[in-house]
């Protein structure tokens, strides 16, 4: 990962900002409200901070989603864009700001009285849409905190990992997201070597469990670096 240019107290390994990226109409590039950092004897702010490159929504902030900055642009170049407010057009839930979700191409409120029924409809409706639900149900709605009093079991539809019971994570499965088991030691895991590879996964694996990390299997020697098998291993 690339280092940022601020200071050693920063989250350095998040990718540095891209220059000159502009959002397409109705999708403003998100701008940080100013970053504080120690500069001499007083704090200075940086107001013209640019967005981060990303491979998936989870790499962006909670008020952002990951997409190509221009319509019909290079699919490989994605950045974190500001989330869409209510009544704005959308293609998937993650595009909508917290408290909203994507229904029939429009961001609507995650009203707790009717949301549960509509989420089932949305799976069916979205099936044929132009890659609209590859990223499935994402983290933005208030579903887990306001509606699900019991955590989702394996196979339950989810929006984020906190919707799932302990030992499970929320991962893509076809065109939705379901609770799947967190990976155990020795299990095959996915290590994304190239940015943008996440979007191709319609059967997403969970992350490795506590105390484990996804690393190349030591005895797995293949000619191609990218095809090496990764497994969950103790730190």
């Amino acid at each position: 990962t690339l280092n940022s240019v601020l200071n050693s107290n920063a989250i350095k390994n998040l990718p540095p900002p891209l220059g000159g990226a502009a959002g397409h109409p109705g999708s403003a590039v998100s701008a940080a409200p100013g970053i504080l950092y120690p500069g001499g004897n007083k704090y200075q702010t940086i107001d013209n901070y640019q967005p981060y490159p990303c491979a998936e929504d989870e790499e962006c902030g909670t008020d952002e989603y990951c997409a190509s900055p221009t319509r019909g642009g290079d699919a490989g170049v994605q950045i974190c864009l500001a989330c869409r407010k209510r009544r704005k057009r959308c293609m998937r839930h993650a595009m909508c700001c917290p408290g909203n979700y994507c229904k029939n191409g429009i961001c609507v409120s995650s009203d707790q009285n009717h949301f549960r029924g509509e989420i089932e409809e949305t799976i069916t409706e979205s099936f044929g849409n132009d890659h609209s639900t590859l990223d499935g149900y994402s983290r933005r709605t208030t579903l887990s905190s306001k509606m699900y009093h019991t955590k989702g079991q394996e196979g339950s539809v989810c929006l984020r990992s906190s919707d799932c019971a302990s030992g499970l994570c929320c991962a893509r499965h076809f065109w939705s997201k379901i609770c799947k088991p967190v990976l155990k030691e020795g299990q095959v895991c996915t290590k994304h070597r190239r940015k943008g590879s996440h979007g191709l996964e319609i059967f997403q694996r969970c992350y490795c469990g506590e105390g484990l990390s996804c690393r190349i299997q030591k005895d797995h020697h293949q000619a191609s670096n990218s095809s090496r098998l990764h497994t969950c291993q103790r730190h």
Partner: nanobody, 125 residues
Framework: EVQLVESGGGLVQAGGSLRLSCTAS????????VGWFRQAPRKEREFVTA????????DYADSVKGRFTISRDNAKNTAWLQMNSLKPEDTAVYYC??????????????????WGQGTQVTVSS
């Protein structure tokens, strides 16, 4: 509002391991960046590592890369710092901190708005 409590500190020999936990109360935890900082005697507080709201992005100070691992479980409102191959120079009070992760961008320690009380880690040679 997020309250953070660190645990898991202690005395360990050089080369040993410790795992620190940071347990949060408050619903904002799952949408926050979580970072670990440390402060050794007579030294300034320094950044150790951080993880974004989803766990998809992590960062480490050069001095701990390859030895420390940060992880989190939003369902448990907890973050962990696994510290391996500890060195005497890792001796410090370790603080867990959290800050808004609304936008994917660099955070400095001044933007971490919630802090724990700290847990002492002592590495003997």
């Amino acid at each position: 509002e997020v309250q953070l409590v660190e645990s898991g500190g202690g005395l360990v020999q050089a080369g040993g391991s410790l795992r620190l936990s940071c347990t949060a109360s408050g619903s904002a935890f799952s949408s926050s960046v979580v970072g670990w900082f440390r402060q050794a005697p007579r030294k300034e507080r320094e950044f150790v590592t951080a993880i974004n709201w989803s766990g998809a992005r992590t960062d480490y100070a050069d001095s701990v890369k390859g030895r420390f691992t940060i992880s989190r479980d939003n369902a448990k409102n907890t973050a962990w710092l696994q510290m391996n191959s500890l060195k005497p120079e890792d001796t410090a009070v370790y603080y867990c901190a959290a800050g808004s992760d609304r936008y994917a961008r660099v955070l400095t320690e001044y933007e971490y708005v919630w802090w724990g009380q700290g847990t002492q880690v002592t590495v003997s040679s």
